[in-house]
Amino acid sequence: YDFTNCDFEKIKAAYLSTISKDLITYMSGTKSTEFNNTVSCSNRPHCLTEIQSLTFNPTAGCASLAKEMFAMKTKAALAIWCPGYSETQINATQAMKKARKSKVTTNKCLEQVSQLQGLWRRFNRPLLKQQGSSDYKDDDDKHHHHHH
């Protein structure tokens, strides 16, 4: 899915209002310095691509994030504010339902959610080049969405 045409500000508002709190709840008892953030993203569409991947794609050692509250709210926000997103996810959702296991919070999942927090942080606070520039400094996002 191409996230270029999403309403980034609405997704950001959804994140700050609810999703972030669910991520904090999931990470409760874990020090913010415990995991080193290694996953990065260059612009807002890229950040959403990475967020979707980490949230919904099962990985080795962490297969259960899609059932978490933050994941369900993320899915809802993307469905509402990204045109055509929900249609692209129907097949993926069916496959996920079949593959689902019971919720288990592993250290690998905690590390993955820590990476997610970093991606969301980046999504919320992209730095812009000086006013008048038409794109970001280090990527090829030509849409120049405003700072906040």
Partner: antibody
């Protein structure tokens, strides 16, 4: 706990440049926006610019854009602010500050400040 | 640039009394229903410390005598019962639009 430690006080001549460093410890460096804010004696706070160390992307206050350069070294978790063509009005305390964990955009960790005095 | 104007410039309040500081932005700092306005406290010789984020949310470890309100262009920081340790300069900051801008500061003293 995350800490930001800045380089020591500087005394500079008008027309010269100054480079202030800000070393982060106790947490991830590359995925947080790092900002520079200055405060002239008895004055308020003035935002100069910021950097995302993950890819070196920067944003500058237009007021300083021709004179300020913000860089970061991920290997040492250090951010730098260089200000050129110094004038007496640049005499100030320069702070580095890190944004919060959650993307709210507030500055939750600050360096102790570096005093830069510009005098002939 | 968004200009942040605080009032008053200085304020003297008796211990235990309410202190109110206002901040007006030259244009709205709201976006998608959220207000991107923060408040900081700065004591002499120290860096600023966050008090309130996004207009009304209390920062970590900040006493609940501090509160914030407002939206759009008009915001208020309130200290419900002034304590001696609250003597400081208070700044509002908008982060909705680059460049990020601060108010000129309000100096709070004890009467």
């Amino acid at each position: 706990e995350v800490q930001l430690v800045q380089s020591g006080a500087e005394v500079k001549k008008p027309g010269s440049s100054v480079k202030v460093s800000c070393k982060a410890s106790g947490g991830t460096f590359s995925t947080y926006n790092m900002h520079w804010v200055r405060q002239a004696p008895g004055q308020g706070l003035e935002w100069m610019g910021a950097i995302y160390p993950g890819n070196g992307e920067t944003s500058y206050n237009q007021k300083f854009k021709d004179r300020v350069t913000i860089t970061a070294d991920k290997s040492t978790s250090t951010a730098y602010m260089e200000l050129s063509s110094l004038r007496s009005e640049d005499t100030a305390v320069y702070y580095c500050a890190r944004e919060d964990d959650y993307g709210e955009g507030y500055f939750d960790v600050w360096g102790q400040g570096t005093t830069v005095t510009v005098s002939s | 640039d968004i200009v942040m104007t605080q009032s008053p410039d200085s304020l003297a309040v008796s211990l235990g009394e309410r202190a109110t500081i206002n901040c007006r932005a030259s244009e709205s700092v709201d976006n998608s229903g959220l207000s991107f306005m923060h408040w900081y406290q700065q004591k002499p010789g120290q860096p600023p410390k966050l008090l309130i984020y996004r207009a009304s949310n209390l920062g970590s470890g900040v006493p609940d005598r501090f509160s914030g309100s407002g939206s759009g262009t008009d915001f208020t920081l309130t200290i419900s019962s002034l304590q001696a340790e609250d003597v400081a300069v208070y700044y509002c900051q908008q982060i909705n639009t680059d460049p990020l801008t601060f108010g000129q500061g309000t100096k709070l003293e004890i009467k």
